[in-house]
């Protein structure tokens, strides 16, 4: 229904705390360079204004759209052009073009320093002094580094953060209480970020229909006992929520997500038997819980689908009458039977089915033409299954770090023109799939592996889009979202690449590496590995292993030496020489 004042409506629905948090996230995602204090000031002004509209919906400007109100605030920031360059040009436009312009200027890889966690005592002190400001800083720092982070989920992670600090700051050993718990939240939040970015990419590049297909497949797997009408309703609502968040309409998004959670909890009987535990939780936890609820038990006696989608004489008639509904039903029926498939795979099968009907229904004898379509799915199913088996076997053999290195070599060979930091980040993230997925039961491995890889590769594509350097990557990234992972997997050594010259300074290290945390040490070694592959793209795995083992031995020796600096300066050049010889 229409409200006289949109801002008053959202303030009332969300409550002050969530309202302020969401406005802070919105501003931080749009203007990623501004300080927390600058944004906090704007948030307070918007909140004060919202309160005046709650008191009197007819007050001046209360009838304005949220985009107009927020955009006007952002455009009033002093020194906008100095700090943001051409983003300031957005302010010359009218809504809705102005908001579209802000969205186009979101930076997926802002040049901000890594978000460093203060040491435990300092964190607890500032948290106790002002929990609200502390949490505000958290929202601001995460949102500006992840401009598409799913806003209501970020509120959930902030709440988790709050609970951990409340608990651990009361302990004697704050550090050992905080570190594993906060590491856990950070890991989950980073995965949430890449997954949501993938959804926004789907929405931006291929529109609502593509996202809705994704939602139908995912929801049908999770709720196999719900009927098609129920799945369609949930998919439509979920598409609206995600469209709003991806479009920067964070208040509407959070409000509609809360409504969707409410609807699901009020209609458990027709959706799933697994929702009650989630529905007993408070709002943020409830919505989060519902988003990752375990799959309901599959119905015992689902018939084969060939009767309706291949053997029925009316297939082409049914398809022609309502293409999207017919294909949606196919996707629903296939997905509810296969919780063991990835959503990407299910969408590839639906796409193949659609292409077959398009071709066959135009022919003289359609049934003879589409009669074998389900059998033709077999290679599409076998390919990701083999990928999972091969990669999980390799992960089990090498462990996470070794597996990351194997992927790093593979991807540097596929796209050696890509910058080393991007290759290292991608390989480290892709390599985590082993730890995340390979330990799961058989029927959960494929969906875990492929959907996670797809999200990571989406980030590779976004970073590459900014500065395109590899034709291989451009080719895989310009196709459909669900074909990306198979495309990257199929890439081989880039034969067009001219190897990099060997530069000794690339492989020169100093004693400061010894005091780095383990993760940073790994990144240094992986950077060297990528550079080695760029120098010798056709080096064998054995050659690379020899060099890396030598390198590890060199670090170990020099970091244990009494005079580290001398060891690095004398042994370093010897290492470089040995490397060159080993790769000759």
């Amino acid at each position: 229904e229409a409200h006289k004042s949109e801002i008053a409506h959202r303030y009332n629905d969300l409550g002050e705390q969530h309202f302020k948090g969401l406005v802070l996230i919105a501003f931080s995602q749009y203007l990623q360079k501004c300080s927390y204090d600058e944004h906090a000031k704007l948030v307070q002004e918007v909140t004060d204004f919202a309160k005046t509209c709650v008191a009197d919906e007819s007050a001046a400007n209360c009838d304005k759209s949220l985009h107009t109100l927020f955009g006007d605030k952002l455009c009033a920031i002093p020194n906008l052009r100095e700090n943001y360059g051409e983003l300031a040009d957005c302010c010359t436009k009218q809504e809705p073009e102005r908001n579209e312009c802000f969205l186009q200027h979101k930076d997926d890889n802002p040049s901000l320093p890594p978000f460093e966690r203060p040491e435990a005592e300092a964190m607890c002190t500032s948290f106790k002094e002002n929990p609200t400001t502390f949490m505000g800083h958290y929202l601001h720092e995460v949102a500006r580094r992840h401009p598409y982070f799913y806003a209501p989920e970020l509120l959930y992670y902030a709440e988790q953060y709050n609970e951990i600090l409340t608990q651990c700051c009361a302990e004697a050993d704050k550090e050992s209480c905080l570190t594993p718990k906060l590491d856990g939240v950070k890991e989950k939040a980073l995965v949430s970020s890449v997954r949501q970015r993938m959804k926004c990419s789907s929405m931006q590049k291929f529109g609502e229909r593509a996202f809705k297909a994704w939602a139908v497949a995912r929801l049908s797997q999770t709720f196999p006992n719900a009927d098609f009408a129920e799945i369609t309703k949930l998919a439509t609502d979920l598409t609206k929520v995600n469209k709003e968040c991806c479009h920067g309409d964070l208040l509407e998004c959070a409000d509609d997500r809360a409504e969707l959670a409410k609807y699901m909890c009020e209609n458990q009987a027709t959706i799933s038997s697994k929702l009650q535990t989630c529905c007993d939780k408070p709002l943020l936890k409830k919505a989060h819980c519902l988003s990752e609820v375990e799959h309901d038990t599959m119905p015992a006696d689902l018939p084969a689908i060939a009767a309706d989608f291949v053997e029925d004489q009316e297939v082409c008639k049914n398809y022609a009458e309502a293409k999207d509904v017919f294909l949606g039903t196919f996707l629903y029926e296939y997905s509810r039977r296969h919780p063991d498939y990835s959503v990407s795979l299910l969408l590839r099968l639906a796409k193949k089915y659609e292409a077959t009907l398009e071709k066959c229904c135009a022919e003289a004898n359609p049934p003879a033409c589409y009669g074998t379509v389900l059998a033709e799915f077999q290679p599409l199913v076998e390919e990701p299954k083999n990928l999972v088996k091969t990669n999980c076997d390799l992960y089990e053999k090498l462990g996470e770090y070794g597996f990351q290195n194997a992927i790093l070599v593979r991807y540097t060979q596929k796209a050696p023109q890509v910058s080393t930091p991007t290759l290292v980040e991608a390989a480290r993230n892709l390599g985590r799939v082993g730890t995340k997925c390979c330990t799961l039961p058989e029927d959960q491995r494929l969906p875990c592996v492929e959907d996670y890889l797809s999200a990571i590769l989406n980030r590779v594509c976004l970073l590459h889009e900014k500065t395109p350097v590899s034709e291989h990557v451009t080719k895989c990234c310009s196709g459909s979202l669900v074909e990306r992972r198979p495309c990257f997997s199929a890439l081989t050594v880039d034969e067009t690449y001219v190897p990099k010259e060997f530069k000794a300074e690339t492989f020169t290290f100093h004693s400061d590496i010894c005091t780095l945390p383990e993760k940073e040490k790994q990144i240094k070694k992986q950077t060297a590995l990528a550079e080695l592959v760029k120098h010798k793209p056709k080096a064998t795995a054995e050659q690379l292993k020899t060099v890396m083992d030598d390198f590890a031995q060199f670090l170990d020796t020099c970091c244990k030496a009494a005079d580290k600096d001398t060891c690095f300066s004398t042994e370093g050049p010897n290492l470089v020489t040995r490397c060159k010889d080993a790769l000759a």
Epitope: M298, D301, A304, A306, R337, H338, D340, F377, Q378
Partner: nanobody, 115 residues
């Protein structure tokens, strides 16, 4: 062509046990359902137990606690362990394996529970 072969049926005394096996030969992929059905003389076909791709198991009320269905994915095999057998369990037992493309049935194996 897919063929299912059941084995393990026979004559057993009340309270006894049997283990039925079903193996699929030929190219069957993308299995989402494996089940055992039975048909007693003069009766219709009834679902005894099924196991879906996610590992969920379903049992007819009359066999709950006595029968256990299991599978071996790598070999496309499905089993039915039947304990505390009763005369009412006498029937021909059929194995059923499904993928989206079709429903594949065995020829059946006779189970007779009698003293």
């Amino acid at each position: 062509q897919v063929q299912l072969v059941e084995s393990g049926g026979g004559l057993v005394q009340p309270g006894g046990s049997l283990r039925l096996s079903c193996s699929a030969s030929g190219s069957i992929w993308g299995i989402y359902h494996m089940g055992w059905y039975r048909q007693a003389p003069g009766k219709g076909l009834e679902l005894v137990a099924s196991i879906t791709v996610d590992g969920s198991t379903h049992y007819a009320d009359t066999v709950k606690g006595r029968f256990t269905i299991s599978r071996d994915n790598s070999k496309n095999m499905v089993y039915l362990q039947m304990n505390s057998l009763e005369p009412e369990d006498t029937a021909v037992y059929y194995c059923d394996i499904r993928n989206v493309g079709g429903d594949y049935w065995g020829q059946g194996t006779q189970v007779t529970v009698s003293s």
